[in-house]
Interface confidence: medium
């Protein structure tokens, strides 16, 4: 079989070399497809103009053919969620090639030098795809091409430069640095497959954001807000790993992207939904759980291709593990009255009691301030399916249980010195489920007992009416 | 520099079980799948098996599948290679190789254990 | 399971000549692996992907071949490299070596 290394390999005029040099250049992208889920099994190495190993390694021409890209890398070998991906793409996708991009002398280099050579190593694999189209029966349109962190871009200039245009683009979580605010042409955009999704794990407002920040797909899945992911923190990592540093944590929230989309694979009974949102403040507020009008998604693999003359910028929570999916609620609470509120926020808590299971304790999240005369809209969310909602009980955090509202509870009655209870008036709560989309009223049990105060807890059950349904399409109807 | 350290020789009863272990240095554990292949006196090589440190998966050789387990502790970087049922024909040196995944070939040895199975 | 035949067994050579290793597989494999064991020691990789010098390696060595037949050259022996050489594949499970060739001083 031919040499592994073959002419797609070759450094380019891009690196600016002298010509002279550039022969003597030991060849730096390899195409591996992987012929087993194993990573022991050493696959076969495909070369642009060299039929055989296609032939000798039973590459399908008709099925779908995915290329794994990888990123900048500080080890310079492959990392363990490569191996993963591998191995669920192979199990989901039995009969489909599966090729990784080996650039690793590329990416092995100053970050900086490495966001150089994105350029070439995305023409290697426009190049490889240009001579696999020559080939009877491989289509474009079956290519699905999966880069992390600087391998999305690499993806990106790949579906720039091939002729025609690659079915799909995966970017988990592209990188930021270099690459925020750059030209679309010098980054992954929309542009460069006929369907583009992106998951962003690691994004910051403040400090350095290894991802990128900016919309650059069709869609752009922001899971947990793009930034803090759940079991990434130092404690979990200090937990987990015997060395847990800052390093751990980065290493973590920048590498859930794949894990995501590893989940999606492989847990395809458990999907988790995006929902359409403008920011990630009014997703927190609980404002934007609609699946109308394309507004909700799957993540990953299953995701519904979705060609928006805009980006669409998309959220849910997650767990901290596999599988990640968790179930989204929406609650709007009318507060008709309340007295005697001082400057302090109340703490809110419900729980959810459903005809599977029973929820935990759950915070309500107040993102800006409790409105009177006004609903105001939560999200809460549930690791477990708790099947339909029955009743819902409403806690008022008494002051003592948090030195923080202690202190302002002091204060204010410093200043007030004759303050009375304060009270809150809530008659009823309306839920809406993200992942079922339905929408249910729950009452006070007492209707003559609507207030609540700290310390206290209000019960409340489903109303007469019952469920109302919206005509409202339902996000799991819709799976495979 | 990358070392593999193994545990010292070993001498066993027919039908006892033996446990070598293989401590690793200077490179992130986790990342490197890790094989065992042994050595019968005056013989050639043989592969008995693998285990990835990251997430404990194991691949065995199916002529020792029923007698050999491989496990790891990553707390230590240690991966152990435990044969039960142990025969005079499993006398040989013991061997833990690092393979890089997706590289493709055995690039640093332990340098081996002796188990000598005599009655 | 894929079974390696090396051939010759032994090789008896003076330093300076040309060895030639040979490695013929029972089905086809997409590479082959080279190793170099001395007496008490652990194995060292010389070749990979068929035709890859390892690192550290001198270039005196180099691998060729494909399918079933596979071959190791030592352009001109040194003293160093009077040692036993193992093919190995890893193209299926288990992944199996080759019986061995001596190559000793004539």
């Known amino acids: 079989s031919p040499v592994p290394f073959g002419p797609e390999g070759r450094l380019e005029d891009k690196l600016h070399k002298p010509k002279a040099t550039q022969t003597e250049v030991k060849p730096s992208v390899r195409f591996n497809l992987r012929t087993s889920k194993d990573p022991e099994h050493e696959g076969c190495y495909l070369s642009v103009g060299h039929s055989q190993p296609l032939e000798d390694c039973s590459f399908n021409m008709t099925a779908k053919t995915f290329f794994i890209i990888h990123g900048w890398t500080m080890s310079g070998i492959f990392e363990n969620w490569l191996h993963k991906l591998v191995s669920a793409l192979h199990t989901r996708e039995k009969d489909a090639n599966v090729v990784v991009v080996d650039w690793l002398p590329l990416a092995h280099q100053l970050y900086t030098d490495a966001v150089n050579n994105t350029r070439v190593v995305g023409h290697s694999i426009a190049r490889m795809l240009d001579w696999l189209q020559e080939k009877d029966d491989f289509s474009l349109g079956n290519v699905h091409l999966i880069g992390y962190s600087l391998g999305a871009h690499v993806a990106g200039y790949a579906g720039n430069f091939v002729k025609g245009t690659v079915g799909r683009i995966t970017g988990l979580d592209p990188a930021g640095p270099m690459f925020e605010g750059a030209d679309i042409h010098k980054r992954l955009s929309p542009d460069d497959a006929d369907f583009v999704d992106v998951l962003h794990t690691y994004t910051r407002s403040f400090g350095l954001s290894i991802g990128i920040q900016m919309p650059v797909g069709h869609i752009d899945i922001y899971p947990n807000g793009g930034d803090f992911q759940p079991g990434c923190g130092l404690n979990d990592v200090l937990g987990s790993i015997a060395y847990g540093t800052i390093t751990e944590v980065v290493k973590c929230e920048h590498e859930r992207a794949v894990h995501l989309f590893v989940d999606s694979l492989v847990n395809q009974d458990k999907p988790s939904f995006a929902f359409q949102c403008t920011d990630s403040n009014r997703f927190k507020k609980g404002i934007c759980l609609s699946c109308r009008k394309n507004r909700c998604n799957s993540i990953g693999y299953n995701a519904k291709k979705m060609r928006n003359k805009r980006n669409s910028k998309m959220y849910l929570k997650t767990r901290a593990g596999m599988p990640f999916r968790v179930y989204h609620y929406q609650m709007k609470i009318h507060v008709f009255s309340y007295k005697n509120m001082g400057e302090i926020e109340p703490t809110f808590y419900v729980t959810l009691y459903g005809t599977n299971a029973d929820s935990q304790t759950l915070p309500l999240e107040i993102v800006e301030r409790i409105e009177q005369n006004a609903t105001n809209t939560f999200l809460v969310y549930t690791e477990e399916d708790l099947g339909d909602l029955l009743k819902i009980q409403l806690t008022w955090e008494g002051a003592s249980q948090s030195w923080y509202n202690l202190w302002k509870e002091f204060r204010s009655y410093l200043s007030q010195p004759r303050n009375p209870g304060r009270e809150l008036n809530i008659r009823r709560i309306r839920v809406k489920s993200g992942e079922t989309q339905r929408k249910l009223t729950f009452c006070t049990e007492d209707p003559e007992n609507t207030s609540i105060s700290p310390g206290r807890e209000l019960w409340f059950r489903k109303c007469r009416d019952g469920w109302r349904m919206k005509n409202e399409t339902s996000p799991t109807v819709e799976l495979p | 520099q990358v070392q593999l350290v193994q545990s010292g020789a070993e001498v066993k009863k027919p039908g006892a079980s033996v446990k070598v272990s293989c401590k690793a240095s200077?490179?992130?554990?986790?990342?490197?799948?890790m094989h065992w292949v042994r050595q019968a006196p005056g013989q050639g090589l043989e592969w008995m098996g693998s285990?990835?440190?990251?997430?404990?998966?194991?691949s065995y050789n199916e002529k020792f599948k029923d007698r050999v387990t491989m496990t790891r502790d990553t707390s230590t970087s240690t991966v152990y290679m435990e044969l039960s049922s142990l025969r005079s024909e499993d006398t040989a040196v013991y061997y833990c190789?690092?393979?890089?995944?997706?590289?493709?070939?055995?690039?640093?040895w332990g340098q081996g254990t002796t188990v000598t199975v005599s009655s | 399971e894929i079974v390696l035949t090396q051939s010759p067994a032994t090789l008896s050579l003076s330093p300076g000549e040309r060895a030639t290793l040979s490695c013929r597989a029972s089905?086809?494999?997409?590479?082959m692996y080279w190793y170099q064991q001395k007496p008490g020691q652990a194995p060292r990789l010389l070749i990979y992907?068929?035709?890859n010098l390892a690192p550290g390696i001198p270039a005196r060595f180099s691998g060729s071949g494909s399918g079933t037949d596979f071959t190791l050259t030592i352009s001109s022996l040194e003293p160093e490299d009077f040692a036993v050489y193992y093919c190995?594949?890893?193209?299926?499970?288990?992944?199996?070596f080759g019986g061995g060739t001596k190559v000793e001083i004539k």
């Open positions: 190789a690092r393979y890089g995944n997706y590289v493709g070939y055995f690039d640093y």
């Open positions: 200077g490179y992130t554990f986790t990342e490197y799948t």
């Open positions: 285990i990835n440190p990251y997430y404990g998966g194991t």
């Open positions: 089905s086809s494999v997409h590479y």
């Open positions: 992907y068929t035709s």
């Open positions: 190995q594949q890893f193209t299926s499970s288990p992944y199996t």
